[in-house]
């Protein structure tokens, strides 16, 4: 009676149970009465990471210099290449295939988040108390000045894009 | 039904490349591979290698430098390249068909010889 | 490479006579998914080889069932119940488990 269902890391073929290809090769031959399936390495640049019967194995995929890709991790026979973006850039998509700047939080927001080759800048807006002069995607929010401490007084209100104006207190004559 | 024909020249001088031709009916060669064997007068079976139907090969480590299996899907025929081959290659070669192990073509003898 | 070591190399029989050749592997030749690709050749005289018995025990299709095949692991053995006439020629086993497949030397079995 031929089988209907087979094992795991099988297929079923021509009323038979042939083994599948391991990952790091493709199927070359199904099983016949007189031999096992039959696997080939995949080649240099190619890799297939699953138990399987491809007939071909999938390229490497290229990080492409010109849209700001790196190598993160070199593929093998049995694993993809994982590409991430060059210093100042970061991925557009999770499957990292081009890149783009850092956003930089323009004055009256500071950095969140400092963006990494898979995230972009976080920013938020300068509560009050804060501010941002730049336009930057390093720079957080600083907090005004305290003139007090430098036994100054307030000259000109701070806002969210600047601080605040110190001087010094009027003298009683 | 399945045949397979071997044909070549007979004569091969020492050095020189022995080229083969298997002519195969009865199934095809884009879905199955074939495979070479010979057999020294006298002597035991060696396989040499084979050819899988999507063109991928094998070959004996003990001949790989020297040989090249090829096909052409639109002809129903595969080709054997032996290069630099010396007295030690007489023999009947073989083609065989992957799965069908029960039939062997006629074999060609191929004598290298001066 | 998997050497393959038959044995006796000549092997004289009387008509009617059981007759056993013995194989041996230098490895295993269980593969992974538990099959054994074992076969069994007989080159009769001036012919090409033809299939026997593939699988260790599996007759092929048209042979009589005077052939058997057992053995398993690297020990394999060939055995003909009553040796006919037409059962003249040289025996190969062969193993198609590993690449590159091999066979062994041959066995010629000839009548006493």
């Known amino acids: 009676e031929p089988p209907t269902a087979c094992r795991e890391k099988q297929y079923l073929i021509n009323s038979q149970c042939c083994s599948l290809c391991q990952p790091g090769q493709k199927l070359v031959s199904d099983c016949t009465e007189f031999t096992e399936t039959e696997c080939l390495p995949c080649g240099e640049s190619e890799f297939l990471d699953t138990w399987n019967r491809e007939t071909h194995c999938h390229q490497h995929k290229y990080c492409d210099p010109n849209l700001g890709l790196r190598v993160q991790q070199k593929g093998t026979s049995e694993t993809d290449t994982i590409c991430t973006c060059e210093e100042g850039w970061h991925c557009t998509s999770e499957a990292c295939e081009s890149c783009v700047l850092h956003r930089s939080c323009s004055p009256g927001f500071g950095v969140k988040q400092i963006a990494t080759g898979v995230s972009d800048t976080i920013c938020e807006p300068c509560p009050v108390g804060f501010f941002s002069n730049v336009s930057s995607a390093f720079e957080k929010c600083h907090p005004w000045t305290s003139c007090e401490t430098k036994d100054l007084v307030v000259q000109q209100a701070g806002t969210n894009k600047t601080d605040v104006v110190c001087g010094p207190q009027d003298r009683l004559r | 039904q399945v045949q397979l024909q071997e044909s070549g020249p007979g004569l091969v001088k020492p050095s020189e490349t022995l080229s083969l031709t298997c002519t195969v009916s009865?199934?095809?060669?884009?879905?199955?591979?074939v495979h070479w064997i010979r057999q020294p007068p006298g002597k035991g079976l060696e396989w040499i290698g084979v050819?899988?139907?999507?063109?991928?090969?094998n070959y004996n480590p003990s001949l790989k430098s020297r040989v090249t299996i090829s096909k052409d899907n639109s002809k129903n025929q595969v080709f054997l390249k032996l290069s630099s081959v010396t007295a030690a290659d007489t023999a009947v070669y073989y083609c065989?068909?992957?799965?069908?192990?029960?039939?062997w073509g006629q074999g060609t003898l191929v004598t290298v010889s001066s | 490479d998997v050497v393959m070591t038959q044995s006796p190399l000549s092997l004289p029989v009387t008509l009617g006579q059981p007759a056993s050749i013995s194989c041996r592997s230098s490895?295993?030749?269980?593969?992974?998914?538990?099959?054994?690709?074992l076969q069994w050749y007989l080159q009769r005289p001036g012919q090409s080889p033809g299939l026997l018995i593939y699988?260790?025990?599996n007759r092929f299709s048209g042979v009589p069932d005077r052939f058997s095949g057992s053995g398993s692991g690297t020990d394999f053995t060939l055995k003909i119940s009553r040796v006919e006439a037409e059962d003249v020629g040289v025996y190969y086993c062969?193993?198609?488990?590993?690449?590159?497949?091999?066979f062994g030397q041959g066995t010629k079995l000839e009548i006493k």
């Open positions: 065989l068909g992957h799965g069908h192990f029960d039939v």
């Open positions: 009865g199934f095809s060669l884009p879905t199955s591979g």
């Open positions: 050819i899988w139907a999507g063109g991928d090969t």
């Open positions: 490895q295993s030749l269980v593969h992974s998914s538990g099959n054994t690709y």
């Open positions: 699988k260790v025990s």
């Open positions: 062969s193993q198609t488990t590993h690449v590159p497949w091999t």
